[in-house]
Interface confidence: low
């Protein structure tokens, strides 16, 4: 039985042109994190490997920054960045844990009015 749980920033919104930090935290397990993958739908954004450090996918190099910690910073956001993001924790000896974050990128005027996208 995998005892760990992934805590995420949940459903978040950000302003077009701005930046956002995607954060996941693995708790309640003594398993070691060997690698964390950050994925958007079926695209790999970045990998943080315990041995080799960070690798950012070439197509995202200009807009994705590693950290803080095992998190990921998305910069120069566009409306097309709206969607699901997944943190995939590869651990020893538990196996794989996955966390989900939904990001909505809002037009500036909408963001200023404090709109929030919630998934029930």
């Amino acid at each position: 039985m995998m005892t760990g749980t992934i805590e995420t920033t949940g459903n978040i919104s950000a302003e077009k042109g701005g930046s956002i930090i995607l954060q996941c935290h693995l708790s309640s397990t003594t398993a070691q994190v060997t690698q964390v993958n950050w994925e958007q739908q079926d695209q790999l954004l970045a990998i943080c490997n315990a041995d080799l450090g960070w690798h950012i996918s070439p197509s995202f190099k200009d807009r994705v920054a590693p950290g803080p910690g095992l998190g990921l910073t998305l910069q120069s956001l566009t409306v097309n960045d709206t969607g699901e993001y997944f943190c995939i924790y590869h651990t020893y000896p538990d196996g794989t844990y996955t966390g989900r974050i939904f990001l909505e990128v809002l037009e500036s005027s909408v963001a200023e009015h404090g709109a929030r996208f919630q998934i029930p």
Epitope: M1, M2, T3, S28, T29, T30, A31, Q32, V33, T34, C48, A50, D51, P68, G69, L70, Y92, P93, D94
Partner: antibody, heavy 118, light 107 residues
Framework: EVKLEKSRGGLVQPGGSMKISCVAS????????MNWVRHSPEKGLEWVAQ??????????HYAESVKGRFTISRDDSKRSVYLQMNSLGAEDTGIYYC?????????WGQGISVTVSS | DIQMTQSPSSLSASLGEGVTLTCRAG??????LSWLQQKPDGTIKRLIY???TLDSGVPKRFSGRRSGSDYSLTISSLESEDFADYYC?????????FGGGTKLEIK
């Protein structure tokens, strides 16, 4: 050759403090989760504290019995792990071991004797 | 906390004899269990992890097995250096917890 060199232990009065340490060699210390485990005749082996990696923001975990009194820390540049023990009581008497774990690798240091007595 | 009940607490055996030590987990730990050996001089060494995987350099006479919530360590033919204390350790959830230990003595 893998080595975990211990610091000196000793005798401390109830309510007192002590800091113990462990210096690693022969392996990539910064990749290892480090723990302190203690052994006493009354309680057997008992996990005390853990510190993870730089990539985990050096997250720490503690046994309930030492929370708020003990602090685990590490200095990767010195390949060292430390345990600062405050408000010591008789129940903290024992042999303290540093322990490193990474994937399938597992290393234990020699014990450090800590005696709490007046 | 997950309680690990280890038996027997002590055991006398002869050179060449086979022995089995057991640990029962109070909650599900799904194989996240190690066996440790503590020599009389205090030195601790892990023998087995993930219930049945032998650590590098550990003699093949040591083996681990899981049956439900029961975990066992078997030494097939005792050698003089095997007389020591043995502990199981669960690492399925915080805090990691140890069994009470088995003192293996020479008969």
């Amino acid at each position: 050759e893998v080595k975990l060199e211990k610091s000196r232990g000793g005798l401390v009065q109830p309510g007192g403090s002590m800091k113990i340490s462990c210096v690693a060699s022969g392996f990539t210390f910064s990749n290892f989760w480090m723990n302190w485990v203690r052994h006493s005749p009354e309680k057997g082996l008992e996990w005390v504290a853990q510190i993870r990696l730089n990539s985990d923001n050096y997250a720490t975990h503690y046994a309930e019995s030492v929370k708020g009194r003990f602090t685990i820390s590490r200095d990767d540049s010195k390949r060292s792990v430390y345990l600062q023990m405050n408000s010591l009581g008789a129940e903290d008497t024992g042999i303290y071991y540093c322990h490193g774990n990474f994937y399938t690798l597992d290393y234990w240091g020699q014990g450090i004797s800590v005696t709490v007595s007046s | 906390d997950i309680q690990m009940t280890q038996s027997p607490s002590s055991l006398s055996a002869s050179l060449g004899e086979g022995v089995t030590l057991t640990c029962r987990a109070g909650q599900e730990i799904t194989g996240f269990l190690s066996w440790l050996q503590q020599k009389p001089d205090g030195t601790i060494k892990r023998l087995i992890y993930a219930a049945s995987t032998l650590d590098s350099g550990v003699p093949k006479r040591f083996s681990g097995r899981r049956s439900g919530s029961d975990y066992s360590l078997t030494i097939s033919s005792l050698e003089s250096e095997d007389f020591a204390d043995y502990y199981c350790l669960q690492y399925a959830s915080y805090p990691p917890t140890f069994g009470g230990g088995t003192k293996l003595e020479i008969k």
